[in-house]
């Protein structure tokens, strides 16, 4: 869609990532227009004939929707008048990745913007002390990743140390044959130290921290999506 007509309206999108099997959001905002019936939102995907989603006259019009999106798309209907054209995507599929266009037509004019949507799998790691091992070790597990991530260990006391020789990482394919469970074991750990297990692919980076002392074990996990914005 090229922009025709005298008036351009600003449409803003954000690159984002979808977690396979979960709900996703493709973000798009535009200059608000209080006349809901005059707003048309069209979502398109590069390489796909037909629409991803169309919302006009205050309701969905799915007559031209492409088969691969049937039953899985919705806009935030009550937020359209305030300029939110974001698309909800139910049960994100690996094949949903690609370039999308958010096209807006209101009584003020027309505009569009593209966004890159990445899909994969990412999950929080959990670190536990593995008391079964002959020497004290740490076990870092994360249930769902795709594409295959890299795993690295770090320690607060031995900053900059390379733990690849004293760790073992395995990837186990999950039942749906796409995502994988990540398990990494770090051997010969010492108490009164904080260890970090970092899992990263081109979509997300997750870190699990564990602090082991004589009296307690403290854990913290965080997950960040990469290249969004």
């Amino acid at each position: 869609f090229g922009i025709s007509g005298k008036h351009f309206i600003t449409v803003t999108t954000f690159t984002s990532a979808g977690n396979i099997g979960e709900d996703g959001t493709l973000s798009c905002t535009f200059e608000p227009d209080i006349k809901l019936n005059g707003i048309v939102i069209q979502w398109l995907k590069e390489g796909i004939k037909g629409l991803v989603h169309e919302f006009k006259e205050g309701k969905d019009d799915l007559s031209q929707q492409h088969e691969m999106f049937r039953g899985r798309t919705a806009v935030f209907a009550d937020q359209v008048v305030v300029g939110n054209a974001s698309l909800r995507l139910k049960n994100v599929q690996l094949t949903d990745a690609g370039t999308y266009t958010c096209y807006i037509h209101t009584s003020k004019g027309k505009g569009n913007a593209n966004l890159e949507y990445k899909t994969g799998a990412f999950s929080m790691p959990e670190i536990n002390v593995d008391y079964n091992a002959s020497s004290e070790s740490l076990r870092c597990e994360a249930p769902r990743w795709f594409p295959q991530p890299t795993v690295a260990w770090a320690s607060q006391v031995d900053q900059g140390a390379n733990f690849s020789e004293v760790s073992n990482t395995s990837f186990e394919l999950n039942s749906e044959n796409v995502t994988m469970k990540v398990v990494s074991v770090l051997y010969n750990v010492t108490i009164n130290n904080t260890y970090s297990c970092m899992i990263e692919n081109d979509i997300a980076k997750a870190t699990g921290d564990i602090k082991v002392t004589d009296s307690e074990v403290k854990r913290r996990s965080q997950l960040e999506l990469l290249n969004s914005g």
């Epitope: 309701k59 969905d60 049937r70 039953g71 899985r72 919705a74 935030f76 209907a77 139910k90 049960n91």
Partner: antibody, heavy 121, light 107 residues
């Protein structure tokens, strides 16, 4: 009018498998999700999972991932749920329900009458 | 997995207004939980009432309404009728799965 007609009651032996059906009439079968729900006395309702007919897209409650398998046949407008390795814990009434996902709302509207499953040796 | 909690039973009289609530163990219920309300009458007769927090399922009487009250989802029956005596279940969506509440018996 919209109807979801479920198959009849089943009496099965432990370790066996059962496949129950949910036939949809009165609407475009492939435009709505079919949800499967388990009801046991004293346990309320438990969501098993969902399938979008005409696609291979399914979502399972982690608890039922090994137990249940969903399929759908768009030529007969029928959704199926197979339960494997049956135990007494699987004795329950199983419901299919239609779920609409759209911009104006997201709702379970029509439900089947339920299929009663008894697992006993 | 989250736990969804409802009042186990409520009593009302014809013509009264009654509110049933639905709480999530993970924190405040939001519009992203797509709160659904379902009615069960004897012999396993289920009917969807409300979806997406506050949208009535087509054909459901206007006396049924859904909302968020504080950190909970709520179903309000304004001017309850004798045929509203039933079990009411709420269901909340958690990004990739539904969790049902234990149900409220309305008498």
């Amino acid at each position: 009018q919209v109807q979801l007609q479920q198959s009849g009651a089943e009496l099965m032996k432990p370790g066996a498998s059962v496949k129950m059906s949910c036939k949809a009439t009165g609407y475009t079968f492939s435009s709505y999700w079919i949800e499967w729900v388990k009801q046991r006395p004293g346990h309320g309702l438990e969501w098993i999972g969902e399938i979008l007919p005409g696609t291979s897209i399914t979502t399972y409650n982690a608890k039922f991932k090994v137990k249940a398998t969903f399929t759908a046949d768009t030529s007969s407008n029928t959704a199926y749920m197979q339960l494997s390795s049956l135990t007494s814990e699987d004795s329950a009434v199983y419901f299919c329900a239609r779920y609409y996902f759209g911009s104006s709302s997201f709702y379970f509207d029509y439900w089947g009458q339920g299929t009663s499953l008894t697992v006993s040796s | 997995q989250a736990v969804v909690t409802q009042e186990s039973a409520l009593t009302t009289s014809p013509g009264d207004t009654v509110t049933l609530t639905c709480r999530s163990s993970t924190g405040a219920v939001t519009t992203s939980n797509y709160a659904n309300w379902v009615q069960e009458k004897p012999d396993h007769l289920f009917t969807g009432l409300i979806g997406g927090t506050n949208n009535r399922v087509p054909g459901v009487p206007a006396r049924f309404s859904g909302s968020l009250i504080g950190d909970k989802a709520a179903l309000t029956i304004t001017g309850a009728q004798t045929e509203d005596e039933a079990m009411y279940f709420c269901a909340l969506w958690y990004n990739n799965h539904w969790v049902f509440g234990g149900g409220t018996k309305l008498e």
